[in-house]
Interface confidence: low
């Protein structure tokens, strides 16, 4: 660390000056400012907020702040023809209708332009039929229904509870099962924590609260009409029939009061086991259809939403690097919200705003980072990560040559228990070292480091005395940078205690009740957790942009590669006979991992010893570190997922939110016992082992001495 604090007289400031400038009170003020009205993507309100942020970032001192606009496919309810679900009797009369909107929270009764709950990109339709309860609509839930219970969902409307996996995967699974409509609901078992009141008296979901969200299966494509390329003024757009990832059946979300009315009448099969029961006073019968007295009644969906090409706006701020202006460290988070965005995204956007202000203060006092820092306020994240993906598509050539790292900054909190970090293994040591320098905000850990409280509350399952750091999945704006472009990425936020709170996400996620007051009253009154997240995110950016040698440790990649190879091998070894029959060997992969480990070790030794005053050698070593993540990219992408190109990590094919290791091999092995052509299936396993082994070996060689 350098020894000078921030004045205008030296660029060699230490991180302390940057961190000391971050203030909880400012984050609180910014959060309030960003959450007073809705900022739905594609609306005038969100455009105005983009211009406000542009203006303020300029005031804060960034070198330039530009708006980058794209015309992308978005989805909105029809204002004059609302979406709802009915129970209809044998005469077709609607004897029950779900609510058309959430009761507004206190103080927000007169706010206009609150979008009613809807599933973005649902096609229009008015299907009617019998209901089937499909639990969480996970792959394994449909296996249970179809294979064990012999229940056919074809032609049925399915009702699934939110949680466990991304809602788009639920819809995809329902489509594959032949359903003609999907109803999504929030069960209190997942969205109502025991002993806590519902909003506005606590942070639980009231019965009228509903989770909005998109139901796309984009697999990293960005705008559904312009996959692979930016949705600019001269874009060629696909027809809607060829659009990527759109659902083919109507989908609509409801709250648990309305769900009670649908589920209480369910008949047919009993739930297969207790894991299918939620917390409502209903039998959780699977169906199909209603029980005896109500067997002639059906469920009818009324969905009238429209897909529209709409202009969106990213805000891109630049703080030019003094020494390596052609190396980019990016801090990005989205700005668009479903309604007020009290947590998602504005708790993150407020932190980004304060980080920009702190960097701007240092810059005004004469400091510059070694490398260029780009700050981004993304639009249309809620509609499929569209703003970040279109910008990355437009700038892909620059990013793949110049991108050092991407730090994501969506919601700063999803709880107030401990830190949660997902990142590339290259950043493990950076995160460990940084959190050792930061004070813990947790009660009972006064005077202790963040590392200490984090490790105590969220220990690593593999390494004692270390905290858990998870794999990157998707469902947020780092996706294009990491999964498509191979730029080292990370994210950090404060989270709940997963051991005692089994609900999915936080209860008020994507509802109208996600307000400033929710955060200020119940989650973080002192904004101390927000400040800590600002210090982690900002500290990571500072180090990545300012360290003479990039703070990446390639040896940590070696460790996880061995772990992932062991894991995928053990999955394959569940089929020992087939491995023998089809001559399936993992030797090439284990050999490549061994080579990677040895070469990474030697590289780390050279990194300690080389002459850091020689700018050419310094740049060469840093480039080897920067391009290591890039070396795991397969230009051909994963099977049927061309925009997921990282060979070591991809979003799970069964849950976009989760990361899967060696995804190509994993998917080839998944449910392989049910494949109609085992020879072909095991051939694909062998091909995927070959791709993985080659990629690991090729990545290792990028770390070898260049001559």
């Amino acid at each position: 660390k350098s020894s000078n604090e921030a004045t205008n007289i030296t660029p060699k400031h230490n991180m302390k000056a940057f961190l000391d400038e971050l203030k909880a009170e400012n984050i609180k003020k910014f959060l309030y400012n960003f959450t007073q009205i809705p900022h739905l993507a594609g609306t005038e309100q969100n455009f105005q907020l983009a211009k406000q942020i542009q203006s303020q970032w300029k005031e804060f001192g960034l070198d330039s702040v530009e708006l980058a606009h794209y015309d992308v496919l978005l989805s909105y309810p029809n204002k004059t023809h609302p979406n709802y679900i009915s129970i209809i009797n044998e005469d077709g009369n609607e004897i029950f209708n779900t609510s058309l909107f959430e009761p507004p929270p206190p103080g927000y009764e007169n706010v206009s332009d609150i979008v009613p709950p809807f599933s973005a990109f649902s096609p229009q339709g008015m299907p009617e039929g019998d209901l089937v309860y499909v639990n969480y609509a996970r792959t394994e839930d449909f296996f249970k229904l179809e294979r064990d219970m012999k229940i056919n969902c074809s032609g049925k409307i399915v009702i699934a509870r939110y949680g466990k996996v991304f809602r788009g995967n639920k819809v995809k699974n329902a489509q594959l099962a032949g359903a003609k409509g999907v109803i999504l609901y929030s069960d209190p078992a997942d969205y109502f924590a025991p002993g806590v009141k519902s909003y506005p008296d606590g942070w639980n979901l009231p019965g009228g609260g509903v989770q909005r969200g998109n139901i796309l299966n984009l697999n990293g494509a960005g705008d559904p009409l312009t996959p692979g390329y930016p949705a600019n003024e001269y874009a060629y757009r696909r027809g809607i029939a060829e659009a990527v990832g759109l659902p083919s059946i109507p989908v609509h979300p409801i709250g648990y009061y309305d769900a009670q009315k649908l589920l209480e009448k369910m008949g047919g099969s009993a739930p297969p086991d207790s894991s299918w029961r939620g917390s409502l006073k209903v039998p959780y019968n699977v169906g199909p259809g209603f029980t005896g007295n109500f067997s002639t009644q059906k469920v009818k969906m009324h969905i009238h939403s429209t897909n529209e090409v709409t202009r969106i706006y990213n805000v891109i701020g630049t703080l030019r690097g003094a020494v390596e202006p052609d190396r980019y460290v990016i801090l990005g988070g989205h700005r668009d919200s479903w309604v007020f965005g009290g947590i998602d995204p504005q708790s993150g956007a407020a932190v980004v705003h304060e980080i920009v202000r702190s960097f701007g203060t240092l810059k005004k006092e004469g400091w510059r980072p070694r490398r260029t820092i780009l700050f981004a306020s993304w639009d249309a994240e809620e509609f499929g990560l569209l703003g970040s993906t279109e910008w990355a598509e437009e700038n892909s050539r620059l990013l793949q040559e110049r991108g050092v790292a991407y730090i994501n900054a969506d919601s700063s909190i999803e709880g107030n228990y401990t830190l949660r970090v997902d990142c590339t293994p290259l950043m493990y040591s950076l995160v460990h070292n940084l959190t050792k320098e930061l004070k813990s905000p947790d009660e009972g850990f006064e005077g202790k480091s963040l590392y200490e409280s984090w490790t105590k509350k969220s220990p690593s399952p593999e390494f004692s005395g270390m905290p858990r750091i998870s794999k990157l999945g998707s469902g947020n704006d780092f996706e294009v940078f990491f999964q498509r472009l191979g730029i080292a990425s990370g994210r950090a936020r404060y989270t709940k205690n997963w051991e005692t709170n089994k609900f999915s996400g936080y209860p008020l996620y994507h509802s109208v009740y996600e307000t400033y007051e929710l955060v200020e009253k119940f989650y973080d009154p002192m904004f101390k957790y927000h400040l800590t997240v600002a210090q982690v995110r900002g500290g990571m950016v500072f180090e990545l942009a300012n360290s003479i040698v990039l703070p990446f440790d390639c040896r940590d990649y070696a460790v996880v590669l061995r772990k992932y190879a062991d894991k995928i091998y053990s999955i394959s070894m569940k089929h020992p006979q087939e491995m023998k029959t089809y001559s399936v060997s993992f030797d090439s992969l284990f050999s490549a991992v061994k080579n990677f480990t040895e070469i990474a070790s030697k590289f780390s030794e050279r990194l300690q010893d080389f002459d850091k005053s020689n700018p050419i050698v310094l740049r060469m070593m840093n480039d080897q570190l920067m391009f290591l993540e890039r070396a795991f990219i397969d230009p051909l992408g994963l099977p049927d997922r061309p925009f997921y190109r990282h060979v070591i990590y991809a979003p799970s094919s069964h849950n976009k939110y989760a990361g899967e290791s060696f995804p190509g091999i994993y998917d080839a092995l998944f449910d392989i016992e049910s494949k109609v052509d085992p020879s072909k299936a095991w051939g694909e396993v062998k091909r995927q082992i070959y791709v993985a082994a080659f990629t690991v070996q090729a990545a290792a060689e990028t770390l070898s001495e260049v001559a």
Epitope: E5, T7, N8, I9, T10, P11, K12, K364, G366
Partner: antibody
Framework: EVQLLESGGGLVQPGGSLRLSCAAS????????MNWVRQAPGKGLEWVSA????????HYADSVKGRFTISRDNSKNTLYLQMNSLRAEDTAVYYC??????????WGQGTLVTVSS | DIQMTQSPSSLSASVGDRVTITCRAS??????LHWYQQKPGKAPKLLIY???NLQSGVPSRFSGSGSGTDFTLTISSLQPEDFATYYC?????????FGGGTKVEIK
């Protein structure tokens, strides 16, 4: 109008003290680091001291360390330089200057300090 | 401390001439080099910052170049109001230091 106005210069005996002031107007004072730079008669420019926008960080040239103190009052938009144990070689025109992006992009008109017996 | 050496210390030139002043740092200062103009009895005025960036309001006949240790200020066509003393300054490390100045006089 964006400007800096120094005051407080004058004749002082060796070993004496003087306090210079610099009044800022037309910009958000607490956003900027501020500097004192001096110029001896017929000579070049010599940086003297700097203070961060919040006032929390200060730096001094070796030639004045321990004798001069830089400070600021952001509520009054004013920068100060307290000069003690003055020497003949401190004789110079003293300029206050605003620091932005590692440059001094706004200067006052200067105030003359003469140290002589 | 980083030493800044300007050359020449003075030069005579005519209106319309192309004038070049150089500044050399005793060690690499990246692009943290700034140029100032000072007229007799007046305060210095920033011309160029970060080696090559023209300060707002400064005529485009002034330009700067260089990085590392060697830097140049160029006046493409000298005007009567350009006769003054020019200083370079580094802000790469503490303390910031100025060059000795280059006085541009009328031939």
């Amino acid at each position: 109008e964006v400007q800096l106005l120094e005051s407080g210069g004058g004749l002082v005996q060796p070993g004496g003290s003087l306090r210079l002031s610099c009044a800022a107007s037309g910009f958000t004072f607490n956003n900027y680091a501020m500097n004192w730079v001096r110029q001896a008669p017929g000579k070049g420019l010599e940086w003297v001291s700097a203070i961060s926008g919040s006032g929390g960080t200060t730096h001094y040239a070796d030639s004045v360390k321990g004798r001069f103190t830089i400070s600021r009052d952001n509520s009054k938009n004013t920068l100060y330089l307290q000069m003690n144990s003055l020497r003949a070689e401190d004789t110079a025109v003293y300029y206050c200057a605003r620091g932005v992006a590692a440059t001094l992009n706004l200067w006052g008109q200067g105030t003359l300090v003469t140290v002589s017996s | 401390d980083i030493q800044m050496t300007q050359s020449p210390s003075s030069l005579s030139a005519s209106v319309g001439d192309r004038v070049t002043i150089t500044c050399r740092a005793s060690q690499s200062i990246s692009r943290y080099l700034h140029w100032y103009q000072q007229k007799p009895g007046k305060a210095p005025k920033l011309l160029i910052y970060d080696a090559s960036n023209l300060q707002s309001g400064v005529p485009s006949r002034f330009s700067g170049s260089g990085s590392g240790t060697d830097f140049t200020l160029t006046i493409s066509s000298l005007q009567p109001e350009d006769f003054a003393t020019y200083y370079c300054q580094q802000s790469y490390s503490n303390p910031p230091t100025f060059g000795g100045g280059t006085k541009v006089e009328i031939k």
